[in-house]
């Protein structure tokens, strides 16, 4: 997260760290007791490493009573996701067992009504992604509150030049932005999961290149079918 600040510890009990061989790779969001939603491209970077999900964490390194690392029973990328595009960039991870819920571990309600979030709405994005252009990684969870940007502006030739589909949404990226390592993390608007950080190689913190998020409401049928 660029230009953000440290999150209040455990105030985002849905927040997950998707890890490979014990290292943070991507963000994720607990959407059901045994399921974490993330970005499909995160799996590409995992290669053949052991994928696990850390729940209940604020610090990645320090011991915390609520922290627990779960093995992944099944990884289900969206069937239409492709390595060369950010379309359908969603991944569902089934934990090896149901998560132990508590104040620091709790699924987040996700948006099912397939309608755009109003531009100007302030939404929270959080993650353990890089906090500087130099690539500095934080140990503790960071967050930033960003305004949603209208799709027409996001699709301008000077911005994302028509690449933003109806199944995506954008948020402002003027010095404050999601970045490398935040992919798969949640964009939360008023207590409801609206978007998942896409995992392209987009430049971060440049206002002409807004943050791109996959709209979960657009994938409600797929999510329901996998969770069923």
């Amino acid at each position: 997260i660029l230009g953000g600040r440290e999150a209040e510890a455990h105030a985002r009990p849905y927040m997950a760290s998707v890890q490979v061989n014990g290292e943070h790779l991507c963000g994720g969001v607990l959407v059901a007791e045994q399921w974490v939603l993330s970005a499909a491209h995160c799996l590409e970077d995992a290669a053949d490493g052991k994928v696990q999900v850390l729940l209940g964490a604020h610090s990645l390194s320090q011991p915390e009573p609520s922290k627990r690392l779960y093995d992944v029973l099944r990884a289900v990328p969206h069937p239409d996701s492709r390595p060369d595009t950010i379309d359908h960039d969603l991944l569902l991870l089934q934990l090896s067992e149901k998560a132990t819920l508590g104040p620091a571990v709790r699924p987040l309600p996700w948006q099912r009504v397939d309608r755009d979030v109003e531009p100007g709405t302030l939404c929270d994005v959080a993650g353990w992604g890089i906090v500087s252009h130099a690539g500095r990684r934080p140990d503790r969870l960071q967050h930033v509150l960003l305004p949603v940007l209208d799709r027409a502006t996001c699709n301008r030739r000077t911005h994302h030049d028509g690449a933003i589909t109806q199944r995506m949404m954008c948020a402002e990226s003027n010095r404050r932005d999601s970045c490398k390592g935040d992919s798969g993390g949640p964009l939360v608007c008023g207590g409801v999961l609206e978007g998942v950080v896409t995992s392209g190689s987009r430049v971060c913190g440049n206002r002409k290149k807004p943050g791109i998020y996959t709209r979960v409401a657009s994938y409600a049928a797929w999510i329901d079918s996998v969770l069923a």
Epitope: G3, P119, A126, H143, V188, G190, G191
Partner: antibody
Framework: QVQLQQSGPELVKPGASVKISCKAS????????INWVKQRPGQGLEWIGW????????YYNEKFKGKATLTVDKSSSTAYMLLSSLPSEDSAVYFC???????????????WGQGTSVTVSS | DIQMTQSPASLSVSVGETVTITCRAS??????LAWYQQKQGKSPQLLVY???NLADGVPSRFSGSGSGTQYSLKINSLQSEDFGSYYC?????????FGGGTKLEIK
Amino acid sequence: QVQLQQSGPELVKPGASVKISCKASGYTFTDYYINWVKQRPGQGLEWIGWIFPGSGSTYYNEKFKGKATLTVDKSSSTAYMLLSSLPSEDSAVYFCARYGYYGSSFYAMDYWGQGTSVTVSS
Amino acid sequence: DIQMTQSPASLSVSVGETVTITCRASENIYSNLAWYQQKQGKSPQLLVYAATNLADGVPSRFSGSGSGTQYSLKINSLQSEDFGSYYCQHFWGSPPTFGGGTKLEIK
């Protein structure tokens, strides 16, 4: 403690412009959105727009686009609102207010300035 | 824009009574609602955020409830300092519009 101190009352002629200020203290000015709200005499509250002092990003109520211009001066922790081409119906009290954050993504206007009265009259 | 319909517009009550003010949103606002109190000639003060949470320093006789499109503010055992105007405001989308207000007067 958090305080938002607004500039004093203004008497302006129709068609003129006025710039009112809101000086913040007691918190990190660049971390919180500042809103502006209009209240006509004996009437309710109307949201004008917000500015994020850290980046200068703004967002306006469609109704106030072209009417209000929001700016900040980070060095003095002051937010400004310029109101232009004022007709008599812009006579109102204008408030600045900070967005406080709650939990992961809830917010509300937790601290308000005392209000600036703008009277448009010839 | 989401419309916020507040009722009643005015209310005349006695000290010690309990009052409920309601706010109806034109669509689901997912508990993204705040309540404010405003005394004559003063700025509004935050009472409740996220529909049900009391802001710091607000007496426990105030309580917020509701979900979806229907919300209410209840004041138990009214005190003399509770008289004034009350406004709801949503934060689900932009612009974050206010209700028309409820004026609470002493009977």
